[in-house]
């Protein structure tokens, strides 16, 4: 009997078998394993994708390709021998005994053979199709590079050439550069020697000032003394001789008084007979501490303690708490005496304030209150004023009732803003008020319209910065 | 150099209207408050008007409430008085001037006159027949 079935084995390759009788033929059909399959990005008989591959990956797959061929060919040659040599006793059984199916099966196989083969063809003619285009892709790529190649050596070359121009300028550079630093270092030298003698200069001159501001002082104090010592001498000649001119008098022994030495004010200066004006030592009430002040001995019968002078803008009054407390500056020229000092001062006695003023066009005011003092710093060394009389305004231009001091860093004032930063300088700031003596410095003609000047603006208005000021306190009853 | 410049005055009629202009320079009026003043012959400077916050505040004076309209063009750093209604009384040198918008007193709206700094030279502002 005979039959034939197809089947496929564990391999997944596809069988041919026929049964013959007692004989078996089994045709193993080759498979295409080593083209892929179409899932790939790259089908056997798909077009041509427009990124070229890497033409090693190329090369290599050709090589691949041309030994599948290679294969195909010999296993065709094999197969062909196999029927021609093997087949051929059986062929004469078969022609003799084959039955009409039979034939049927070999031409079946037959088909398939071919078709099979007629597959491998095409697939071969897609992949020279493909190498064809991979290859004239691969041959401009090439060209395109050594074109890029030529160029980017032409502008390698270029750019070599600027490098070294670049160098030799940079060295030129450097030359200067270097000559440069050596004038430079030299010069810096010089100029450091220069200044370390001025240093030393300055500061002997420095030492020469302080001592002769010492001598100017105790020469004032010196001459005071003798001009009381002359004025007490002439009292005592002038006593003796009356008595001696009366008869009837008894004979006395003239008892000084013991010489005052502490000083709280500059009213006690005056009364002791110091009367030129010039700088004092003054001692703190109740303690030994000393300060420096201006007593000015001419204004208005003399003995003022003057507590603030303005006159030149060299003196940075924007200060802080502790500085406005202690006092700044220098007595000689423009200065804050204290606040602590004058709190001190003015609470034990009664004291009145005058202020002058002096504006840009050769003006001069006043104010006069009659009670001043200030607060302890428990209070913000608040401002207590009142009787004002003077040339610099009807109504006060520090604001009643007093305010607290304020300054950069102790904001008491009663505005939103920070009167002592919009306005710059510590003072009895309300907000912000009618004054501030000592805000910023402004020369002539660049005076007005300043949200931050010298104002007192009873006597000159908003925005006028003032060209000198002075605050002086004396004892009520002097 | 804060400079303040007024225009905008002259002769007018009872009834008639004039719009005065204050230019100003050195200062931004985002962070100015300007007030128009004015000053009759032999009389004290008087507050009329006064506007902060690009506008959003205003304050007038009794007398000219309901005829008179402040105004301000930032882009143009100009605040405008616009007077309707004119009235003899009316007649005075007329100032704008500027302060600090921050300068304020806890729970005031607006600044007494001696904490405006800056002012302008005035313009003449007279109403008669």
């Known amino acids: 009997y005979s039959n034939f079935r197809k089947s496929v084995d564990s391999t997944g390759r596809r069988q041919y078998q026929v049964q013959n009788g007692p004989c078996s033929y089994t045709f193993l059909l080759p498979e295409t394993d080593s083209c892929r399959s179409s899932s790939s990005p790259y089908m056997s008989n798909a077009v041509q994708r427009d990124a070229p591959l890497d033409y090693d990956d190329s090369v290599q797959r050709l090589q691949v390709l041309e030994n599948i061929l290679e294969n195909n060919t010999q296993w065709l040659m094999k197969l062909e021998n196999y029927i021609q040599d093997n087949m051929k006793k059986e062929m004469v059984e078969i022609q003799q005994n084959v039955v009409q199916n039979q034939t049927a099966v070999m031409i079946e196989i037959g088909t398939s053979l071919l078709n099979q083969t007629a597959a491998q063809t095409r697939k071969l003619t897609d992949v020279e199709a493909q190498v064809l285009n991979q290859t004239t892709r691969l041959e401009l790529q090439l060209l395109q590079h050594s074109i890029s190649t030529n160029k980017l050596e032409k502008q390698i070359l270029d750019q070599t050439s600027e490098i070294n121009k670049l160098q030799n300028k940079n060295s030129f550079l450097e030359q200067k550069v270097l000559d440069m630093e050596g004038k430079h270092s030299e010069q810096l030298q010089s100029m450091k020697e220069q200044k370390d003698e001025l240093q030393v200069l300055v500061s002997k001159q420095s030492s020469v000032i302080d001592e002769l501001e010492k001598k100017l002082v105790t020469a004032t104090v010196n001459n005071s003394l003798l001009q009381k010592q002359q004025h007490d001498l002439m009292e005592t000649v002038n006593s003796l001789l009356t008595m001696m001119s009366s008869p009837n008098s008894k004979s006395s022994v003239a008892i000084r008084k013991e010489e005052q030495t502490t000083f709280r004010d500059c009213a006690e200066i005056f009364k002791s007979g110091l009367t030129t004006s010039g700088i004092y030592t003054l001692t703190f009430p109740n303690s030994t501490e000393e300060i420096k002040a201006y007593c000015d001995m001419d204004v208005g019968g003399g003995g003022w303690t003057v507590i603030q002078h303005r006159e030149d803008g060299s003196v940075d009054f924007q200060r802080t708490w502790k500085e406005y407390k202690e006092g700044f500056g220098s007595p000689l020229g423009e200065y804050w005496l204290g606040n602590e000092f004058v709190s001190q001062l003015t609470g034990q006695h009664r004291y009145v304030l005058k202020i002058q003023l002096k504006d840009w066009e050769g003006n001069e005011a006043h104010s006069l209150y009659d009670h001043f003092y200030l607060a302890g710093e428990e209070s913000n060394y608040r401002i207590h004023l009142t009787g004002l009389t003077g040339t610099a305004g009807k109504i006060s231009s520090i604001s009643q009732p007093g305010s607290d001091f304020s300054t950069k860093d102790s904001d008491n004032d009663k505005c939103i803003c920070k009167c002592s930063q919009m306005l710059s300088g510590g003072w009895w700031f309300d907000a912000c008020g009618p004054s501030n003596l000592n805000g910023q410095y402004y020369p002539q003609k660049q005076n007005t319209n300043k949200f931050n000047g010298i104002k007192w603006y009873y006597w000159k208005g908003s925005g006028y910065s003032l060209k000198a000021t002075t605050m002086m306190i004396r004892p009520a009853d002097f | 150099e804060v400079q303040l410049v007024e225009s905008g005055g002259g002769l007018v009629q009872p009834g008639g209207s004039l719009r005065l202009s204050c230019a100003a320079s050195?200062?931004?009026?985002?962070?100015?408050?300007i007030g128009w003043f004015r000053q009759a012959p032999g009389k004290e400077r008087e507050g009329v008007s006064a506007?902060?916050?690009?506008?959003?505040?205003?304050y007038y004076a009794d007398s000219v409430k309901g005829r008179f309209t402040i105004s301000s063009d930032n882009s143009k750093n100009t605040v405008y008085l616009q007077m309707n209604s004119l009235r003899p009384e009316d007649t005075a040198v007329y100032y704008c001037?500027?302060?600090?918008?921050?300068?304020?007193?806890?729970?005031?709206?607006?600044?007494?006159?001696?904490?405006?700094?800056?002012w302008g030279q005035g313009t003449l502002v007279t109403v008669s027949s």
């Open positions: 001037a500027a302060v600090p918008a921050g300068r304020l007193r806890y729970g005031e709206q607006w600044y007494p006159i001696y904490e405006y700094d800056a």
């Open positions: 050195g200062i931004t009026l985002d962070d100015y408050a």
């Open positions: 506007i902060r916050d690009n506008g959003g505040s205003t």
